[in-house]
C-alpha cells in the first residue's frame, strides 16, 4: 500500500481551478525527492504533466504548477482554466512515475449548470463590485427598469427605477439609466456577499414587448495564495483591494479555529501583542493597496491570513478580502542568531545580523522599530556610512564577520535604547530579522574616562581598563566616523604570555596620540574582539584645544561625566515603507552626520596594552 494520499475524486466545472494536495510521510528522502503529477493513458503509462523539478507539459503551460512543502509532507498541484478535456485518471507521486509511491486521482470536469440562452456570466470575488449590463429596445426606454433574482421558480425584485431597493441590498446597489440614445442600463452591486451568488434577470418594460437579459453571478471566496517562508525570516503580504475602498480602514487578520479572524494589525492602531516588534503595516498607495511585513517568523505564525477593508478595521461579510496560507519552513536557510541581546546602562551591545550570503555586495541597514500607529522603522545606520545624527559616536555597522553576517555595535547605552531593531538589506527581503535590546542591571566591563580634552601638539594617553575575563581577547582602539570605526595602529604589545596569568583585578590598553592635531578631535572606541566577532566597546570623546601649558597630558582613568542624552528621533527620519523596502535609497533625504575628517594615522596614534597596577577597582 502506497503511503502517498490524496483525494480519490475531484470534480469541478469548466473554467475553474483545482488545487490537489497530495500528502506523503515527510522522511528526509521523501522531502527531497522528485514530486510529479501524471496522466494515465490507455497503455497504462503515466505521462508527466508537471513535476517539482520545473517540468511543465505543453498542455499545462501557463496554467499549472506543482509546489512542494517538505516541512508539511505535502505537495500541491494547481491547475487553472479547466476544460472537459482535463477529465481523466491521474497519479500524484514521488520519485519515478512507473514505480512505487503514488496515489490515483480521478478528475471530472463538467460543463456546469445549464443556463438560459444568452446568459452573461459574471465571476467576482466576495467583497468586490459587479456591474450588470442590461440592454433594452427604444420603445422600452421610458418604461420601468428592474433587476430580479431567481430563487427556485420565483423571481424576487432586487432594484427598480422607481427607487425600490430590496433590504438585502440596502446601501450597496444602484441602478443607472444612461442619457438618451444609449440603450443599456446598468446595475452596480458593491461589497458582494456569498449569498448574492445566483441567476439574475434584467427587465425593461412589461407585457409581451418587455426586454429581458439573464445574468449568472458567481461570487467566490478568494483561493488563498500559498506562501512558504523560512523560520526566523520575513514575509510580506501585498494587499490590493481596489480603489472602491481606498479610504476605508485596512487590516490583516488570522483565521482561528472558531472560524473567526483575529486582527493582527490594522490602520486604526490595533496590533496583536504576539507580533510586537516584528510587524509593520506599510502606508498605502493612492490605489488603496498596502503591505504588511512580519519578521522573525515563528512556527506558530503559520495559518490562514486575510487582508481586508472595513471602517471597523476588522473582517465583515461582504467587504473585499485577499487570502494567504502561510507555511513556515523549520529547515531554514536563515541561521540562528540571538533574538534578545542584553546590555547594561553605559555599556554596549554587538548585534549579529544575518543576510543572504549570495548577496555580499548588498547595502546593509539597521533600523529601530517604532510601534506608534501602524509601526515604522526609521533607519539608524547603513553600510554606506550614514548614521542618524543622535547616534553620532556610538553606532557603527561593520561588514564583519562577512559571509552572511554583518555586525552592528551600539554603545553608551541608556534605558531609552531598549526596544526592537531590524536588520535588513536592499537585497532579499525575506532575510529581514528582528532583535530586541534589553537594558539590564550591571556595570560596563570596559572602563574609559568621560570626555577628554587634548592639547594641540602635545601627547595624549587614554587608558581603557578591561577585566581578566577579556585577557584572551584581542583589544583595539579605533576612531569612529560615520563610515565605520578605523582601527588605530598599535605598538608591539609584547608576548601574549603576558595575559596567561591574570591575577590583577583589571588590565588596560592605552591609546596614545602624539602629537595631538586638530584632526584628532572626535569619538574613539576601545573594544574587544575574537577574530571577526566583536565584543564590548566603550566610547570616549576627545576635544582638542589650543596649548595652554607645556608638557604631556595623561588622562586619569577616573570615570568622567557621561555624555548628555541623545536627541529624540525627529519625524523627518527615513523609514521603511513600501517602495523603500525594495530599494532603501528611495527614502526621503535627511540630515546625516558629516564625516569627521581624516582618520588618525601614521605613527602619531598608538595603542599600548599593559597591566594597570595603579588601578585597584574591580570590574564585573
Amino acid at each position: 500500500k502506497s503511503p502517498v494520499f490524496g483525494p480519490q475524486e475531484v470534480s469541478s466545472v469548466e473554467g475553474n481551478s483545482v488545487s490537489i494536495k497530495c500528502y506523503y510521510p515527510p522522511t528526509s528522502v521523501n522531502r527531497h525527492t522528485r514530486k510529479y503529477w501524471c496522466r494515465k493513458g490507455a497503455s497504462g503509462r503515466c505521462i508527466t504533466l508537471v513535476s517539482s523539478e520545473g517540468y511543465v507539459s505543453s498542455n499545462y503551460a501557463g496554467r499549472a504548477n506543482l509546489t512542494n512543502f517538505p516541512e508539511n509532507g505535502t505537495f500541491v498541484v494547481n491547475i487553472a482554466q479547466l476544460s472537459r478535456d482535463d477529465s481523466g485518471h491521474y497519479k500524484c507521486g514521488l520519485g519515478i512515475n512507473s514505480r512505487g509511491l503514488s496515489f490515483d486521482v480521478s478528475l471530472e470536469v463538467s460543463q456546469g449548470p445549464e443556463l438560459p440562452n444568452g446568459t452573461e456570466v459574471y465571476t467576482v470575488d466576495v467583497g468586490r463590485t459587479v456591474t450588470i449590463k442590461c440592454p433594452f429596445k427604444t420603445e422600452n426606454a421610458p418604461k420601468t427598469k428592474a433587476l430580479y433574482k431567481k430563487i427556485g421558480q420565483t423571481s424576487v425584485l432586487v432594484i427598480d427605477s422607481r427607487n425600490y431597493v430590496n433590504p438585502n441590498y440596502k446601501d450597496r446597489i444602484r441602478l443607472r439609466i444612461p442619457g438618451t440614445g444609449q440603450l443599456i442600463f446598468t446595475v452596480v452591486i458593491d461589497r458582494l456577499r456569498l449569498s448574492d451568488h445566483g441567476l439574475y434577470l434584467c427587465q425593461a418594460g412589461d407585457g409581451s414587448n418587455r426586454d429581458e437579459k439573464n445574468a449568472d453571478l458567481q461570487v467566490l471566496e478568494p483561493e488563498p495564495e500559498l506562501v512558504y517562508e523560512d523560520l526566523r525570516g520575513s514575509v510580506t503580504f501585498h494587499c490590493a483591494l481596489g480603489l472602491e475602498v481606498a479610504n476605508v480602514a485596512k487590516f490583516l487578520c488570522r483565521v482561528n479555529s472558531r472560524e473567526t479572524c483575529d486582527v493582527v494589525i490594522n490602520t486604526l492602531g490595533k496590533r496583536d501583542s504576539a507580533f510586537e516588534g516584528r510587524i509593520l503595516l506599510n502606508p498605502q498607495d493612492k490605489d488603496g493597496s498596502f503591505s504588511v511585513v512580519i519578521t522573525g517568523l515563528r512556527k506558530e505564525d503559520e495559518g490562514r491570513y486575510l487582508c481586508g477593508a472595513h471602517s471597523d478595521g476588522q473582517l465583515q461579510e461582504g467587504w473585499p478580502i485577499q487570502a494567504w496560507q502561510l507555511f513556515v519552513n523549520e529547515e531554514s536557510t536563515i541561521p540562528r542568531s540571538p533574538t534578545v541581546v542584553k546590555g547594561v546602562a553605559g555599556g554596549s551591545v554587538a548585534v549579529l545580523c544575518p543576510y543572504n550570503p549570495k548577496e555580499s555586495q548588498s547595502l546593509k541597514y539597521w533600523c529601530l522599530w517604532e510601534g506608534a500607529q501602524n509601526g515604522r522603522c526609521p533607519l539608524l545606520v547603513e553600510s554606506q556610512g550614514l548614521v542618524q545624527e543622535q547616534y553620532e559616536g556610538r553606532l557603527s555597522l561593520l561588514q564583519e564577520p562577512g559571509n552572511g553576517t554583518f555586525t552592528v555595535i551600539l554603545n553608551q547605552l541608556t534605558t531609552q535604547d531598549a526596544g526592537f531593531y531590524w536588520c535588513l538589506t536592499n537585497g532579499d527581503t525575506r532575510w529581514r530579522t528582528t532583535v530586541e535590546i534589553k537594558i539590564i542591571e550591571g556595570e560596563p566591563n570596559l572602563k574609559v574616562p568621560g570626555n577628554v580634552t587634548a592639547v594641540l601638539g602635545e601627547t595624549l594617553n587614554i587608558p581603557c581598563h578591561f577585566p581578566c575575563k577579556f585577557s584572551s581577547y584581542e583589544k583595539y582602539w579605533c576612531k569612529w566616523s560615520n563610515t565605520g570605526c578605523q582601527t588605530l595602529p598599535s605598538q608591539d604589545e609584547g608576548p601574549s604570555e603576558a595575559f596567561v596569568n591574570c591575577d590583577e583585578n583589571s588590565r588596560l590598553v592605552s591609546l596614545t596620540l602624539n602629537p595631538v592635531t586638530r584632526a584628532d578631535e572626535g569619538w574613539y572606541w576601545c573594544g574587544v574582539k575574537q577574530g571577526h566577532f566583536y565584543g564590548e566597546t566603550a566610547a570616549v570623546y576627545v576635544a582638542v584645544e589650543e596649548k595652554k601649558v607645556a608638557g604631556s597630558r595623561y588622562v586619569s582613568p577616573a570615570k568622567a561625566d557621561a555624555a548628555p542624552d541623545e536627541k529624540v528621533l525627529d519625524s523627518g527620519v527615513r523609514e521603511i515603507e513600501n517602495k523603500a523596502i525594495q530599494d532603501p535609497r528611495l527614502f526621503a533625504e535627511e540630515k546625516v552626520v558629516a564625516d569627521t575628517g581624516d582618520q588618525a594615522g601614521g605613527s602619531r596614534a598608538s595603542v599600548d596594552s599593559s597591566s594597570s597596577e595603579e588601578q585597584g577597582g574591580s570590574s564585573k
Epitope: V10, S11, V13, N16, Y23, L194, Q218, E223, R304
Partner: nanobody, 126 residues
Amino acid sequence: EVQLVESGGGLVQSGGSLRLSCAASGRTFDQFTVGWFRQAPGKEREFVTAIRWSGSTTYRYYADSVKGRFTISRDNARNTVDLQMNSLKPEDSAVYYCAGQMSQWSDPRGDDYDSWGQGTLVTVSS
C-alpha cells in the same frame, strides 16, 4: 462557530445499507472540509472519508477499507454532508463522528478539525 449534528445511525444486517447525515448550523463557508471518523469499542478513532469543497470544486477522500462501498456527498440546499454506506460488514460497527475544519491544507485524515459532532452509533449484525 459551526455546530455539527450526526443522524441516521442504527442497526443493519451485514450486506445492508445505511445513510448517515451531518447537519451544519452556524456560519457556512465557500471553503470547508467535513470528515467522517469512526471509533469501535476499545479501538482508536479512525478516518473513514472526507469531502472538501472550494467554490464549485469538490474533493473526496476515502480510507482504503471503505473505498468502493461508501460515498460521501454534500447537499447544499439542506446544508448537510451525507455518507452513503453500502455492503456493510460487521467490522464497520462503530460510533461515527463528523468533523469540520476551515483549513484547506491539512491532511483530512488528521485530527486537527475545529468542530466535532456528538456521534451516531452504527451496528452491523452478521
